[in-house]
């Protein structure tokens, strides 16, 4: 947010940039929270635009019985590992095909015990205020599906008839991590010392971090003909004087006609 200055007063302005603003030779460059010629005004809305998507990661272990473990599988750049990764990924894509939040799998480690596959199942959903519920539901479906497939696709007479076979007892969910997004917390942090006066309101499921000086929201302060200005003690209405009226009151809703006042004074002289 920048305000340009022209003329002789500019040098003077340079030394007067407020609130951490810096002079660039032409104008005060204001930090995110401020604007105005001298960075003296506090913004009424802060962009806390949520991420487009929210991710979750499930740490799982399954035991693949249809492949015999070899030392080469420990080396992630080996032909063996690369092939295992391709087949395992293809198999998991089939298993989780009905889950819209499913993105893919990432093998972290292969170890002996038939082939014990430590891997992450990656989930992603479009941001909405209900993202936690959406991802919680998806993780439950992942658990159901992996439990089902590792129970059904098993070796019979030491031979697998499926793309991959598993040990039913080797399936474990170690950990589930969901990317945390807390708009209220972000809003408070970004508003710094004005944090008590900024709130999050939703419009079309998108969060907006606003002060009461931002018009058009349920918390908006109506200053009528005045101007809403944020200070450390909260939002205040700065009332205007027009050619005909003085305005006063907390919301500048009390107008006094100048002619009446002048007339009254005149009468006293």
């Amino acid at each position: 947010r920048t305000t340009t200055c022209f003329g002789d007063g500019c040098q003077n302005t340079a030394s007067r940039c407020k609130n951490g603003g810096t002079w660039d030779g032409l104008k005060c460059q204001c930090p995110n929270l401020y604007y105005g010629e001298l960075c003296e005004e506090v913004v009424s809305s802060i962009d806390i635009g949520p991420p487009e998507t929210i991710s979750a990661q499930m740490e799982l272990t399954v035991t693949v019985t249809s492949v015999k473990f070899t030392e080469e599988l420990k080396n992630h750049s080996s032909q063996e590992f690369q092939e295992f990764k391709q087949t395992f990924t293809e198999q998991m894509n089939i298993v989780y095909s009905g889950i819209p939040e499913y993105v893919g799998v990432n093998i972290t480690k292969l170890r002996l015990g038939s082939v014990v596959v430590e891997h992450d199942v990656l989930l992603r959903t479009k941001y909405t205020p209900e993202y936690k519920t959406v991802l919680d539901n998806a993780t439950e479906v992942v658990k159901e599906k992996i439990t089902k497939v590792t129970t059904q696709q098993i070796m019979i007479n030491d031979i697998c008839s499926d793309m991959m076979c598993f040990n039913t007892t080797g399936t474990q969910v170690q950990n589930i991590t969901v990317t945390q997004y807390d708009p209220e917390e972000d809003c408070r942090k970004m508003a710094k010392e004005y944090g008590d006066y900024f709130v999050v309101e939703y419009r079309d499921q998108k969060p907006y971090c606003i002060s009461p000086c931002e018009p058009g929201f349920s918390v908006s302060k109506n200053c009528n003909l005045g101007k809403c200005q944020m200070s450390l003690s909260g939002p205040q209405c700065l009332c205007v004087t027009t050619e005909t009226h003085w305005y006063s009151g907390e919301t500048c809703n009390q107008g006094t006609q100048k002619s009446l006042v002048y007339g009254h004074h005149h009468h006293h002289h």
Epitope: T65, S66, V67, K68, T70, E72, S78, Q79, E80, E83, F84, Q86, T87, E90, M155, D158, I159, C160, S161, D162, M163, M164, C165
Partner: nanobody, 124 residues
């Protein structure tokens, strides 16, 4: 990348024999799996036999047990299928398949590398 080239197909009378070969190249290890699959017209591809090149395992489909023998020559990197006592129902395109893993699955989807196939016709 792994390349597989089959040869040895042809027309043979019932009760006769044939030997199929499959030359493999592109492996970084000398321990891997190789298999023979076949596909008859209008039918799904099915396993005939597989072998681990370290000699650790061989497998035969019930329909060919005692008649077919799978083997592998490590020095030549070549897979063989000796087919004896051939029957009309053995008529199919025979495919060589390979994996750098020691596989124990007969599902063709688990086998990533394939030859172009060689036709075997058993007919009088």
């Amino acid at each position: 990348d792994v390349q597989l080239v089959e040869s040895g197909g042809g027309v043979v009378q019932p009760g006769g024999s044939l030997r199929l070969s499959c030359a493999a190249s592109g492996y970084t290890s000398n321990r891997y799996s190789m298999a023979w699959f076949r596909q008859a017209p209008g039918k799904e591809r099915e396993v005939v036999a597989f072998i681990w090149t370290d000699g650790g395992r061989t497998y035969y489909a019930d329909s060919v047990k005692g008649r077919f023998t799978i083997s592998h020559d490590n020095a030549k990197n070549t897979l063989y299928l000796q087919m004896n006592s051939l029957r009309a129902e053995d008529t199919a395109v025979y495919y060589c398949a390979a994996s750098s893993l020691l596989l124990q699955t007969i599902n063709p989807r688990a086998w990533p590398y394939w030859g172009q196939g060689t036709m075997v016709t058993v007919s009088s």
